[in-house]
Interface confidence: low
């Protein structure tokens, strides 16, 4: 009679994470009598997956009834597969011995590969804001996928980016993999409303890639432009000076008026107007009582934006042409904030 062979017909099996893997194994003979065991791996470190005679194997079920005398099907199902279950599984026949069972013959092995979806890509930008014309780096990370093959693309407002570098780790065999990519993006003044998108495509996603986004509003700082102008005289001894603060982002801004280098008033931008590109405009004005000045006045609008060093714009106010009113010691009329701001 021909000697028993242990046949594992599937060289490899591919299963999606969370599903059930069926590992097939048949024997060609009922002789010798003895149990089977399933192992993952070979050698001293091999892991027992199923033992016909003993133990608790809650994730494993047999395909056929192993208690039947004529059974030669030793296939098993392993439920709720995870990437950690990947490996080569061996069906091993034992011969009933005296006093103990001994290993008789092993199947050739079935390699179980697990398809696992990548995690949602997480995109992160630089820790500090940057101004237009500067290049900033964005990173994208996704983890836990298998097999290793994966495609990652970067987009800015729907336009594909080309300046990026991607690594998939680890380099060798692993139960699951991670991808890390860094893209370089040049900022423009119009990028407040822009988005950077990292797109990951993998066999497990069935053509529906995962996307992670970052808003450039979290990254960009658009510094303001300043313009100081003198308005027509509102009253005989008063001059209205305005400081137009244009095209800035984010909103955090503090303005200080200086008269001949001395602080006259400080205010914080609150109600601002928003431009179509997402930047803001703001205006502050100062009523100067020219009769309080004997000489020309240098008015300076000084703006500190988003914690950056102050920028300023000055305006020389000529007072010689205006009559001087004695007894007035107020150089600037410190009206309420709402009155000072023109929107």
């Amino acid at each position: 009679e021909e000697e028993l062979q242990v046949i594992q017909p599937d060289k490899s099996v591919l299963v999606a994470a969370g599903e059930t893997a069926t590992l097939r194994c048949t024997a060609t003979s009922l002789i010798p009598v003895g149990p089977i065991q399933w192992f993952r791996g070979a050698g001293p470190g091999r892991e027992l997956i199923y033992n016909q005679k003993e133990g608790h194997f809650p994730r494993v079920t047999t395909v056929s009834d192993l208690t039947k005398r004529n059974n030669m099907d030793f296939s098993i199902r392993i439920g709720n597969i995870t990437p950690a279950d990947a490996g080569t599984y061996y069906c091993v026949k034992f011969r009933k011995g005296s006093p103990d069972d001994v290993e008789f013959k092993s199947g050739a092995g079935t390699e179980l590969s697990v398809r696992a979806k990548p995690s949602a890509p997480v995109v992160s930008g630089p820790a500090a804001r940057a101004t237009p014309q500067h290049t900033v780096s964005f990173t994208c990370e996704s983890h836990g996928f298998s097999p290793r093959d994966i495609t990652l693309k970067w987009f800015k407002n729907g336009n594909e980016l080309s300046d990026f570098q991607t690594n998939v780790d680890p380099v060798g065999e692993s139960v699951s993999y991670s991808i890390h990519s860094t893209a370089k993006v040049v900022l423009t003044r119009e990028d407040v409303h822009s988005q950077v998108i990292c797109e990951v495509a993998h066999v497990t996603l069935q053509g529906d890639p995962l996307r992670g986004t970052a808003n450039l509003s979290e990254t960009i700082r658009v510094p303001p432009t300043l313009e100081v102008t003198q308005q027509p005289v509102r009253a005989e001894n008063q001059v209205n000076v305005t400081c137009q603060v244009r095209k800035f982002y984010p909103q955090r801004l503090q303005l200080t008026w200086l008269e001949n280098g001395n602080v006259s008033r400080t205010e914080t931008a609150s109600t601002v107007t928003e431009n179509k590109d997402g930047t803001y405009n703001w205006m502050s004005w100062l009523l100067v009582n020219v009769s309080a000045h004997r000489d020309d006045v240098k008015l300076t609008c000084q703006v500190e934006h988003d914690g950056q060093p102050a920028v300023s714009k000055s305006h020389d106010l000529k007072v010689s042409a205006h009559p001087k009113e004695q007894g007035s010691n107020t150089a600037a009329e410190n009206t309420g904030s709402n009155e000072r701001n023109i929107y």
Partner: antibody, heavy 115, light 106 residues
Framework: EVQLQESGGGLVKPGGSLKLSCAAS????????MSWVRQTPEKRLEWVAI????????YYPDSVKGRFTISRDNAKNTLYLQMSSLKSEDTGMYYC????????WGQGTTLTVST | QIVLTQSPAIMSASPGEKVTMTCSAS?????MYWYQQKPGSSPRLLIY???NLASGVPVRFSGSGSGTSYSLTISRMEAEDAATYYC?????????FGGGTKLEIK
Amino acid sequence: EVQLQESGGGLVKPGGSLKLSCAASGFTLSTYTMSWVRQTPEKRLEWVAIITSGDTYTYYPDSVKGRFTISRDNAKNTLYLQMSSLKSEDTGMYYCTRDRPLFHWGQGTTLTVST
Amino acid sequence: QIVLTQSPAIMSASPGEKVTMTCSASSSVSYMYWYQQKPGSSPRLLIYDTSNLASGVPVRFSGSGSGTSYSLTISRMEAEDAATYYCQQWSSFPWTFGGGTKLEIK
């Protein structure tokens, strides 16, 4: 009812030998995977030996490999751990366990390796 | 070998309080196993295959986790739960235990 009773512990000098026994009852020893696990005086657990059902395989960690031997006498339904070239770091409580994972534990026997 | 790090090493809880302890593996493991040991007694299997309760273990015990991060939770602490808890892995040879978390009753 499954019961495991260890014996054979004691005081041994470094370099000495000792054989621990584990008497099993309530099941047939030969058909189960059995292990020895030790607990150090600092209460750390360390697996030291395993013998699979049918005595097919025996495994040991590097810390005891070549010095410890696990075996069983199925007629007596008893598991053994032969220990030689003992070191002070082998000191501890030795437990006999059944199955993988360790569903059943004995009460343990104490080994002290000291001059 | 895979090193299992348990935290905290010592903790205390009042009766009825929820308790969570963790076991971190130096490399990914397939499943985690948890044992309970009371003073003067042998360890006892509590949870096998990460989340399955061993026979006779109260349902207030639960296990969870994957990869390198696993945890054991007691939904409502009872006085009899004061013990040392050990995690263990069978995924990689040699099979190792964590250093233990000692849980005391307040």
